[in-house]
């Protein structure tokens, strides 16, 4: 009994699944006529067929017969050949349409359609567009509007032809979707905000496109807009000059750091050491007299302009070199000094000598062993072996030219 119920339930599920899966997808444009064929129906009456509809206009399944008549005729009627005719498809006509027909021989044929409707909106437009944008701050570029779409679809923005991703690199988008109370068509609005980079493109090109909700329909793009990017104040490079060059100084020596800003007026200059502000009054020059280990570190200056935010210079490294050592080259970060280099070379030299000695001893042993085993067959062979041994020798001694 339970097994029978289970089988029955499965048959029901599968039949419903089959009904959906086996359906032929039809897309129809709103306002246009639609003809759905009833397969297997005799071409002329008398016909044994019926259409079943489950759409936005029906409570559940609505049955239509070839006899027709009544208010439904204005929405859908069965044609003499058995096809179902909808004179002007509307949003409420989305749904399932089924036909069951029996031919003269009593063979039953079923047709199953899944109808979706669409409406392509007018070309989208950018309204309320800005002719100028301020660099470094968020600006409203404009609002893209698409009217009269079904399904809703989506709006997307492009910069110089490439898609703009919201919440990335100062890009934000505010979207709004409204549905017309009578037509049921959608109006989409998308407001674009961007923060143009200082020193970026002075004439960026923005456009907006509408992508339909149903596939196989191409996107519609607006005419592009090209606002100018305005930078209220010059973006000047903050230069940090170090004396002595390279920032390496002997203990007790003096380092002079100068912060050069070409901007007008002269901004306030603050100093940083290892990323921490130094508690000093603003000054374009920082003098470090009688350098000690505590003064070693990475220095930079920050210029604060009255008309725009702070700008930091490149960082320079200040290091102490022992007397007799040569400072690192300009721009290098600190110096290990020649002392360390000499030590490293000494160690390498020692290792090299040891390797050379071991190589020589092993070679001599091999030579002796070879002589004991057998004398060379001819002069050529002996020369060849000598050559081979010679080429091995320098490798063992770190390419040194001298013999043992």
């Amino acid at each position: 009994m339970a097994a029978g119920t289970a089988v029955g339930a499965w048959v029901l599920v599968l039949s419903l699944w089959g009904a959906v899966v086996g359906a032929q997808n039809i897309t129809a444009r709103i306002g246009e006529p639609l003809v759905l064929k009833c397969k297997g129906a005799p071409k002329k009456p008398p016909q044994r067929l019926e259409w079943k509809l489950n759409t936005g206009r029906t409570e559940a399944w609505k049955v239509l017969s070839p006899q027709g008549g009544g208010p439904w005729d204005s929405v859908a009627r069965v044609l003499p050949n058995g096809s179902l005719f909808l004179p002007a498809v509307g949003i409420q006509d989305e749904g399932i349409f089924r036909c069951q027909a029996m031919n003269r021989n009593g063979k039953e044929t079923k047709s199953n359609y899944r109808v979706r409707v669409y409406q392509i909106p007018g070309k989208p437009e950018i309204v309320d567009s800005a002719s100028e944008l301020t660099a470094g701050v968020p600006n409203k570029v404009g609002t893209c509007v698409s009217e009269g779409s079904y399904p809703a679809g989506t709006l997307s923005w492009h910069l110089d032809g490439k898609p703009l991703v919201p919440n990335e690199k100062g890009v934000s988008v505010k979207e709004q979707t409204r549905r017309h109370p009578e037509t049921g068509l959608f109006t989409l609005q998308s407001e674009l905000m961007v923060t143009p980079a200082r020193g970026g493109d002075p004439r960026p090109t923005f456009s907006c496109s509408f992508s339909p909700g149903l596939p196989r329909h191409r996107a519609l793009r607006t005419a592009p807009i090209q606002p100018r990017v305005w930078e209220p104040v010059p973006l000047e490079e903050v230069q940090l000059v170090v004396e002595p060059e390279g920032g390496a100084v002997a203990p007790g020596g003096t380092v002079t750091l100068t912060c050069e800003v070409p901007a007008q007026p002269s901004p306030q200059i603050h100093w940083m050491k290892d990323g921490v502000p130094l508690p000093l009054p603003p000054s374009p020059v920082l003098i470090l007299p009688e350098i000690g280990p505590q003064d070693q570190g990475t220095y930079s200056c920050v210029a604060t302009h009255s008309s725009h935010g702070p700008q930091e210079s490149r960082a320079v490294s200040i290091s102490i070199i022992e007397p007799g050592e040569e400072g690192p080259t300009a721009g290098s970060v600190g110096g290990s000094g020649l002392g360390t280099l000499a030590l490293a070379l000494g160690i390498l030299g020692g290792l090299g000598t040891a390797a050379l000695l071991i190589g020589v001893i092993l070679w001599q042993r091999r030579q002796r062993r070879g002589e004991e085993r057998k004398a060379p067959e001819n002069q050529e062979e002996e020369e060849e072996r000598a050559e081979l041994n010679q080429s091995e020798e320098p490798e063992a001694g770190e390419s040194s030219t001298g013999g043992p």
């Epitope: 800005a130 100028e132 944008l133 990017v229 305005w230 209220p232 104040v233 010059p234």
Partner: nanobody
Framework: EVQLVESGGGLVQAGGSLRLSCAAS????????MGWFRQAPGKEREFVAT????????HYTDSVKGRFTISRDNAKNTVYLQMNSLKPEDTAVYYC?????????????WGQGTQVTVSS
């Protein structure tokens, strides 16, 4: 090339107002981003306010925000600086400047300046 002539400076009591004008002649005025700068005795020239090509965008130095207003009339080739609630520290020679750089931020053309004196 553009020529700039400032006017409207003078002596005013603290708390008073002045309106500076800068008339431009030469090339198309709307191609230039405009700015006002000032230089007090013994000090560096400092930025005051700037306005974009169309006049839609403006920018001020912190010390004048809420008191000064920059505007422009492209039909009259003129840029204005309305100065309200003037303070003695606003005393300076005020210069008008024009920029035809891509971003409108490098000032290539300067006027001769107009003196503004605010007495306490």
């Amino acid at each position: 090339e553009v020529q700039l002539v400032e006017s409207g400076g003078g002596l005013v009591q603290a708390g008073g107002s002045l309106r500076l004008s800068c008339a431009a002649s030469g090339r198309t005025f709307s191609n230039y981003s405009m700015g006002w700068f000032r230089q007090a005795p013994g000090k560096e020239r400092e930025f005051v306010a700037t306005i974009s090509w169309s006049g839609a965008l403006t920018h001020y130095t912190d010390s004048v925000k809420g008191r000064f207003t920059i505007s422009r009339d492209n039909a009259k080739n003129t840029v204005y600086l309305q100065m309200n609630s003037l303070k003695p520290e606003d005393t300076a020679v005020y210069y008008c400047a024009a920029s035809d750089s891509d971003y409108g931020n490098k000032y290539d053309y300067w006027g001769q300046g107009t003196q503004v004196t605010v007495s306490s």
